[in-house]
Interface confidence: medium
C-alpha cells in the first residue's frame, strides 16, 4: 500500500518542519521532580518497541509504523548499556539493581553489589545497595510497585530486596542452609525491608502458609500457599498500618483505590505471575493500566510526592516462549499504562522514565509490505522453498526437531496467539539479548537523559531529579519534598 | 570475569555522578553549523553497535562492554523510524532519500518522492527531491562523498542522484527502453547532476567504456569498464575543473590530499565495492579513516564550510552474508573514521551525525560471560545437544540444508572471519530489519536530535543547522556560510 499523501514531498517536509519546531521549543526544566515514575518494559528491546508500534497502529486501523506509542512522545532518549558485572548479556535481577539502585551487580542477584556471589548467602551482608524507592520513602514520599509478574519477581524486587538468588520467592525456595545463615526470601523482604504504600501484581502463593487454599483457585493445590514458616505475610503487613487494605480481584481494587480511608494497598491478583493480557479475565483481574491508575490515585494524595515503579513484566515471558503475539500485546498494554499515567500526572512535577532491563534475540525482517500484519509472512519463499515469518528469533523453543526439517508456515498459523516464531538454535527458553536498550524521558530533569549511558545512570538521574540521596544538595527549585 | 573495582558500589556511584555532571553541563549551542558531516553505518542497528563496542574494546585488551565507541561519546541520541512508504522494512535507496533529502520514497528508488515507482522510468521526472548536499553546494559550501562501497551505490547516490532503480550503476545496467526515455545511470548522474568536490570509494568499472582494462586488475576482463555509451566519465569529470585530480590507489590519494593545487578529487580504489577491511591491501587501498581524513583536508579549505557524507557501507554486506566478523570489523573501521574526523574538526562549528539507514536481523544473546569473545559460544548446549554461538541471525545464508540437521560448532570455527552464523530461515542473503535505529549527534544544533523521529528528520536538522533551504531564515548566529 502506498498512501497517496505520502507521495507528495510536502507531506514529509511539513511533518519534519513541525518536528523541528517542536525540538526548538524544548526547554529543559530547572525544577526538581516532586514525583518519579519508572516504567520498565521487561525484555523490551528496540525491535520489540518498533514491532509493538506497528501492531498498536494496526489495531487502530492504521498502516502501522507512522503511528506513535505513548513512549514515542517522550522528548528525550538515551541508550542504556545493560551488561552485568559478570555477563555480557544480563538477567532481570542484575539489571534491576542497576536501574533501581544505581550500582551494577552480578547475574541473578538483586539489590547487591558485585561483591556478592550468586547463590552464596554468606556474601549478602555488607553488600546491600539501597534503591531510589527506599530513598524516596525516607524523604517522606509515598512509594509503589506495580507489575504484571509476581511482585516478588526480579524487577520489582530490585526496589526493596537484597538477595543472592532471584529465585528465592518464598522461604520454600531458599535452601535450609541459607535460611540458617539468615538469608530471607523475597516475599518476607517485601513486607519487612521497608514501608511500601502500594503493592500491585501477582504472587499470592508466596505470602501464605503451605496448605492455604488460593481464593481464586481453591481446588488447585499447586496454586495455594507455599510458605514453610507458617507465616501469613499479608496478615503481618495489614497489622503494620491502620489504613492498610488487601485485595485479590479487580472489583476490590477499584473500590479500594477510591476509598479515602485506604492509606496502604496490597493487591495480589494471581498466585504467581498475572495472566497474559490476552488471557486475562477482565471481571477478576485488573489490567496493568488499571493497576497503574489505582496506584496513582493513592500515591498522589501525598503532598511530598511519590515514587512509582510500573512493570510490563510479561513482555519478557512472551519472548522467552518465542511467542511474539504475547510479547507484543503485553507491550501494548504496557504502553497503554504509560499513556494513562500521562493523563493522570503533570510533566511539570513528574519525571517519567520508560526503559527496558534488557532486550531479546527477536528480529523483524524480510521486507514485508507496509500495512501487512506484523505476524505475517515475508514476501517470497526461503531457500528450502517454504514460507517464513517476518518475526523470528535467534534462539528459542520455536524449533521443530522432528526430521530436522524446518516446518512450513501459513499466514493463519503465524497469526495465532499461540504460534511460536522459528529460531536458529533450539532452546527450551529463548534468551535475552545484550544490545543497548532505549530510555525515554519526560518531565523535570528529563533533559539529563542523553547519549549512551550505563544502565546505572537511570537510578542516579531519578535520585538527582528528586534531590534524594546522594544528591540532597541538588540545587534545584522548587526543592524536592515541597508541594507545588 | 568480575573486575575487582566493579565490586565496589563506589565505582558505579562515582561513574554515574560524573556522567550526571557532564549531562548538567550540556549547553545547546545557539549558533549555526558551518560544516555538516553525516556518518552512515549501512545496516548498523543497535545490536551491531553494541557488538562492535565489545569487539573494539576487546581488541584493546579490555573486557568489552564498558568501553566507548567514538559514536558513544556524542552527547545527543534519537531513534529514527526507517520504514519506506511502501515497506515496513526498507532498503538503502529509500532510506538514503529520507536522511539525505528529507522525504520518504519507495523501496529501491533513490532521490525521488514516493510518487515514483520502482523500475518505471516514466515516473522519474517531476518527482525528484533535492539532497542537503546539493543545497549545501548551492550555498557555496564544498561537498564530498566517501564510502567503502562503490560511489554509485544506493546510500551515496542519495546525495546526488534520482533514479527509479538503485541497480542502474552504469548505462549497461539500464534497460534500453529506459535509456530511450531519458533515464540516466547513476555514474552519469554522479558527474553531471551537481559539482561534487570530493568523491572517494569504489566503483571504477562504471566510469569507463566496455573493454577498458582496470589499472589494478588489467587481466581480469570482468573488472574492466562496463559502459556501453563509450564514455570515459572520469575524463569528462576532470575536464570540468582545472584543479581536478583522479586517483586510484592509496599512495596517490595521500599525495593529492596534501597538494594545494587540487580543488576537486575523485578516488576510485576498486572496480566495484572496496574490499572488506580485513581483506584490504593497505599498500594499494586506503582505509575509510584515511579517505575521511583526505576528504576533510580538502573540504576544510573552504571558508564557507562543507558538507561531507561518510559511509561504512559494507557493515551491511557482512550482515547479508551472515558473517558477523566482517560486519563488526567494518563497524570498527567506521567508528575509527568518526574518531579521526572528530580530531580534525571542531564541535564549535561542525554538526556531526552518526546513524544507520536500517538494521539487520542480527542478535547477540545466550548469556556469555563478561570478557568472552563476541564470536564465541554460549555457555551450555542447545536442545539438540550441540553448541551454539552468541551471535545469530533470524534469517540468512548461515544455514546448512544437508540432512536438515543444525551443524555443531566449535569456538575455533565460530571465531573464523569466514564463519557464517546460523539462522532460523535459509536465505541466499540475510535481510534488513525494520526496528528503529540510533542517531548520535554532536555540534551546533545537535540538541534538536531528540526523542523518536521519522528518518526524514535527519536531513531537516542538517539543513536547519546550516541555514540551508528551506531554512535560510533559520535565525541562528553566526549565519551559515560565514567563517568563524
Amino acid at each position: 500500500i502506498i498512501p497517496v499523501e505520502e507521495e507528495n514531498p510536502d507531506f514529509w517536509n511539513r511533518q519534519a518542519a513541525e518536528a523541528l519546531g517542536a525540538a526548538k521549543k524544548l526547554q529543559p526544566a530547572q525544577t526538581a521532580a516532586k514525583n518519579l515514575i519508572i516504567f520498565l518494559g521487561d525484555g523490551m528491546g528496540v525491535s520489540t518497541v518498533t514491532a509493538a508500534r506497528i501492531l498498536k497502529g494496526q489495531k487502530k486501523d492504521k498502516l502501522g509504523p507512522e503511528t506513535f506509542l505513548a513512549m514515542d512522545r517522550f522528548p528525550y532518549v538515551a541508550l542504556s548499556k545493560t551488561y552485568s558485572v559478570d555477563k555480557h548479556v544480563p538477567d532481570s535481577g542484575a539489571t534491576a539493581t542497576a536501574y533501581l539502585c544505581g550500582v551494577k551487580g552480578n547475574f541473578q542477584t538483586i539489590g547487591l553489589s558485585a561483591a556478592a556471589r550468586f547463590n552464596q548467602c554468606n556474601t549478602t551482608r555488607g553488600n546491600e545497595v539501597i534503591s531510589v524507592m527506599n530513598r524516596a520513602k525516607k524523604a517522606g514520599k509515598s512509594v509503589g510497585v506495580v507489575t504484571t509478574t509476581r511482585v516478588q519477581h526480579a524487577s520489582p524486587a530490585g526496589a526493596y530486596a537484597h538477595t543472592v538468588n532471584r529465585n528465592w520467592y518464598s522461604d520454600a525456595d531458599v535452601p535450609a542452609s541459607a535460611r540458617q545463615e539468615g538469608c530471607q526470601d523475597i516475599a518476607t523482604q517485601l513486607i519487612s525491608n521497608m514501608d511500601i504504600d502500594v503493592i500491585l501484581g501477582g504472587g499470592r502463593k508466596y505470602m501464605f502458609p503451605m496448605g492455604t487454599p488460593d481464593p481464586e483457585y481453591p481446588d488447585d493445590y499447586s496454586q495455594g500457599g507455599t510458605r514453610l514458616d507458617g507465616k501469613n505475610l499479608v496478615q503481618e503487613w495489614l497489622a503494620k498500618h491502620q489504613g492498610a487494605r488487601y485485595v485479590w480481584n479487580r472489583t476490590e481494587l477499584l473500590q479500594a483505590s477510591l476509598d479515602p480511608s485506604v492509606t496502604h494497598l496490597m493487591g495480589l491478583f494471581e498466585p504467581g505471575d498475572m495472566k497474559y493480557e490476552i488471557h486475562r479475565d477482565s471481571t477478576l483481574d485488573p489490567s496493568l493500566m488499571e493497576m497503574t491508575e489505582a496506584a496513582l490515585l493513592l500515591l498522589s494524595r501525598n503532598p511530598r510526592g511519590f515514587f512509582l515503579f510500573v512493570e510490563g513484566g510479561r513482555i519478557d515471558h512472551g519472548h522467552h516462549e518465542s511467542r511474539a503475539y504475547r510479547a507484543l500485546t503485553e507491550t501494548i498494554m504496557f504502553d497503554d499504562a504509560i499513556e494513562r499515567a500521562g493523563q493522570l500526572t503533570s510533566e511539570e512535577d513528574t519525571l517519567s522514565l520508560v526503559t527496558a532491563d534488557h532486550s531479546h534475540v527477536f528480529s523483524f525482517g524480510g521486507y514485508p509490505l507496509r500495512g501487512s500484519s506484523i505476524f505475517g509472512l515475508a514476501p517470497g519463499k526461503a531457500r528450502d522453498r517454504k514460507a517464513y515469518t517476518v518475526l523470528l528469533y535467534g534462539n528459542g523453543p520455536g524449533y521443530v526437531l522432528k526430521d530436522g526439517a524446518r516446518p512450513d508456515v501459513t499466514e493463519s498459523e503465524s497469526g495465532s496467539p499461540e504460534y511460536r516464531q522459528q529460531s536458529a538454535v533450539p532452546l527450551d527458553g529463548e534468551t535475552h539479548a545484550g544490545e543497548d536498550v532505549a530510555v525515554f524521558a519526560r518531565g523535570p530533569q528529563a533533559h539529563l537523559v542523553h547519549g549512551v549511558q550505563e544502565q546505572t545512570f537511570i537510578a542516579h538521574v531519578m535520585a538527582f531529579a528528586a534531590c534524594l540521596e546522594p544528591y540532597t544538595a541538588c540545587d534545584l527549585a522548587p526543592r524536592a519534598g515541597t508541594t507545588d | 570475569i568480575i573486575p575487582v573495582e566493579e565490586e565496589n558500589p563506589d565505582f558505579w556511584n562515582r561513574q554515574a555522578a560524573e556522567a550526571l555532571g557532564a549531562a548538567k553541563k550540556l549547553q545547546p549551542a545557539q549558533t549555526a553549523a558551518k560544516n555538516l558531516i553525516i556518518f552512515l553505518g549501512d545496516g548498523m542497528g543497535v545490536s551491531t553497535v553494541t557488538a562492535a563496542r565489545i569487539l573494539k574494546g576487546q581488541k584493546k585488551d579490555k573486557l568489552g562492554p564498558e568501553t566507548f565507541l567514538a559514536m558513544d561519546r556524542f552527547p545527543y541520541v534519537a531513534l529514527s523510524k526507517t520504514y519506506s512508504v511502501d515497506k515496513h522494512v526498507p532498503d538503502s535507496g529509500a532510506t538514503a532519500t529520507a536522511y539525505l533529502c528529507g522525504v520518504k520514497g519507495n523501496f529501491q528508488t533513490i532521490g525521488l518522492s514516493a510518487a515514483a515507482r520502482f523500475n518505471q522510468c516514466n515516473t522519474t521526472r517531476g518527482n525528484e527531491v533535492i539532497s542537503v548536499m546539493n543545497r549545501a553546494k548551492k550555498a557555496g559550501k564544498s561537498v564530498g562523498v566517501v564510502t567503502t562501497t562503490r560511489v554509485q551505490h544506493a546510500s551515496p547516490a542519495g546525495a546526488y542522484a534520482h533514479t527509479v532503480n538503485r541497480n542502474w550503476y552504469s548505462d549497461a545496467d539500464v534497460p534500453a527502453s529506459a535509456r530511450q526515455e531519458g533515464c540516466q545511470d547513476i555514474a552519469t548522474q554522479l558527474i553531471s547532476n551537481m559539482d561534487i568536490d570530493v568523491i572517494l570509494g569504489g566503483g571504477r568499472k562504471y566510469m569507463f567504456p566496455m573493454g577498458t582494462p582496470d589499472p589494478e586488475y588489467p587481466d581480469d576482463y570482468s573488472q574492466g569498464g562496463t559502459r556501453l555509451d563509450g564514455k570515459n566519465l572520469v575524463q569528462e569529470w576532470l575536464a570540468k575543473h582545472q584543479g581536478a585530480r583522479y586517483v586510484w590507489n592509496r599512495t596517490e590519494l595521500l599525495q593529492a590530499s596534501l597538494d594545494p593545487s587540487v580543488t576537486h578529487l575523485m578516488g576510485l580504489f576498486e572496480p566495484g565495492d572496496m574490499k572488506y577491511e580485513i581483506h584490504r591491501d593497505s599498500t594499494l587501498d586506503p582505509s575509510l579513516m584515511e579517505m575521511t581524513e583526505a576528504a576533510l583536508l580538502l573540504l576544510s579549505r573552504n571558508p564557507r564550510g562543507f558538507f561531507l557524507f561518510v559511509e561504512g557501507g559494507r557493515i551491511d554486506h557482512g550482515h547479508h552474508e551472515s558473517r558477523a566478523y566482517r560486519a563488526l570489523t567494518e563497524t570498527i573501521m567506521f567508528d575509527d573514521a568518526i574518531e579521526r574526523a572528530g580530531q580534525l574538526t571542531s564541535e564549535e562549528d561542525t554538526l556531526s551525525l552518526v546513524t544507520a539507514d536500517h538494521s539487520h536481523v542480527f542478535s547477540f544473546g545466550g548469556y556469555p560471560l563478561r570478557g568472552s569473545s563476541i564470536f564465541g559460544l554460549a555457555p551450555g548446549k542447545a536442545r539438540d545437544r550441540k553448541a551454539y554461538t552468541v551471535l545469530l541471525y533470524g534469517n540468512g545464508p548461515g544455514y546448512v540444508l544437508k540432512d536438515g540437521a543444525r551443524p555443531d560448532v566449535t569456538e575455533s570455527e565460530s571465531g573464523s572471519p569466514e564463519y557464517r552464523q546460523q539462522s532460523a530461515v535459509p536465505l541466499d542473503g540475510e535481510t534488513h530489519a525494520g526496528e528503529d535505529v540510533a542517531v548520535f549527534a554532536r555540534g551546533p544544533q545537535a540538541h534538536l536530535v531528540h526523542g523518536v523521529q521519522e528518518q526524514t528528520f535527519i536531513a531537516h536538522v542538517m539543513a536547519f543547522a546550516a541555514c540551508l533551504e528551506p531554512y535560510t531564515a533559520c535565525d541562528l548566529a553566526p549565519r551559515a556560510g560565514t567563517t568563524d
Epitope: I1, P3, V4, E5, E6, F11, R14, Q58, K60, D61, K62, L63, E66, T67, F68, G371, S372, S373 | -
Partner: antibody, heavy 123, light 106 residues
C-alpha cells in the same frame, strides 16, 4: 470509477427487521474497509458500523447506539455490503449511506459515499 | 469513545469573507481528522483528510490545520457555491462526526 448503490430502504414498523444492501463496483471490493453511516431528517451524520478488509480478516465494529441490534456483513463474491437491522425503533428513521474507506496514510477516512437509501420506522 | 465538538452550529457570512469552523476532540486524535461538505439531498463530499490534505479537485480556498485535540477548517474567500453544511470526522479511533455547521450567505 468507484460506485456505491444502496438499496433495501422503505417503510417498516417498530420492532421489525430490515436488511440494507450496497452494491459496489469500480474497485477491488475485498481490499477496502466499508462502513454504514446514517442521517436522521434535519440532523447530523452518525457512523454506525465498520467491516474491515481481507487483510484484517473482515472484522467488525459498531457504534454504541446500534451494537447488538445491527449487523454489518459482506458478500465478497458479489461485492455487496449489508446492514441487517433488527428491533427497529422510530429513532432509526434516517437516510442510510454506505461508504468506502480510502487507505491513505490516515488509514480509513470515508472517501466514497453512495447516494443513500431512506428508512422510515413508523407504525 | 472519542467525542467531537464542532462550532459554531451555524454561521452567516458574505461572499469573499474568510470563514472558520473548529472541531475539538475529547482526546488527542493524532491529526486523523477529515472535513466534509454536504448539500441538501446529497451525500457528503470529502474535502480534506489528515488535517490538511486537500482531496484532488477541491479548490485551494479550502484548508485545514491543527494538532492534538484542536482543529480548524477555513474557507479563505467564501463563494456562493460553498453554501452547505460542513462536518468534521475523527477517524483515529473508529469514527465520530462533529454536529455540523450550517453555512449561509448574508
Amino acid at each position: 470509477e468507484v460506485q456505491l448503490v444502496e438499496s433495501g430502504g422503505g417503510l417498516v414498523q417498530p420492532g421489525r427487521s430490515l436488511r440494507l444492501s450496497c452494491t459496489a463496483s469500480g474497485f477491488t471490493f475485498t481490499d477496502y474497509y466499508m462502513s454504514w453511516v446514517r442521517q436522521a431528517p434535519g440532523k447530523g451524520l452518525e457512523w454506525l458500523a465498520l467491516i474491515r478488509n481481507k487483510a484484517t480478516g473482515y472484522t467488525t465494529e459498531y457504534s454504541a447506539s446500534v451494537k447488538g441490534r445491527f449487523t454489518i456483513s459482506r458478500d465478497n463474491s458479489k461485492s455487496i455490503l449489508y446492514l441487517q437491522m433488527n428491533s427497529l425503533k422510530t429513532e432509526d428513521t434516517a437516510v442510510y449511506y454506505c461508504a468506502r474507506a480510502s487507505f491513505y496514510y490516515d488509514g480509513k477516512v470515508l472517501a466514497y459515499w453512495g447516494q443513500g437509501t431512506l428508512v422510515t420506522v413508523s407504525s | 469513545d472519542t467525542q467531537m465538538t464542532q462550532s459554531p452550529s451555524s454561521l452567516s457570512a458574505s461572499v469573499g469573507d474568510r470563514v472558520t469552523i473548529t472541531c475539538k476532540a475529547s482526546q488527542d486524535i493524532n491529526k486523523y481528522i477529515a472535513w466534509y461538505q454536504q448539500k441538501p439531498g446529497k451525500a457528503p463530499k470529502l474535502l480534506i483528510h489528515y488535517t490538511s490534505t486537500l482531496q484532488p479537485g477541491v479548490p485551494s480556498r479550502f484548508s485545514g490545520s491543527g494538532s492534538g485535540r484542536d482543529y480548524t477548517f477555513t474557507i479563505s474567500s467564501l463563494q456562493p457555491e460553498d453554501i452547505a453544511t460542513y462536518y468534521c470526522l475523527q477517524y483515529d479511533n473508529l469514527y465520530t462526526f462533529g454536529q455540523g455547521t450550517k453555512l449561509e450567505i448574508k
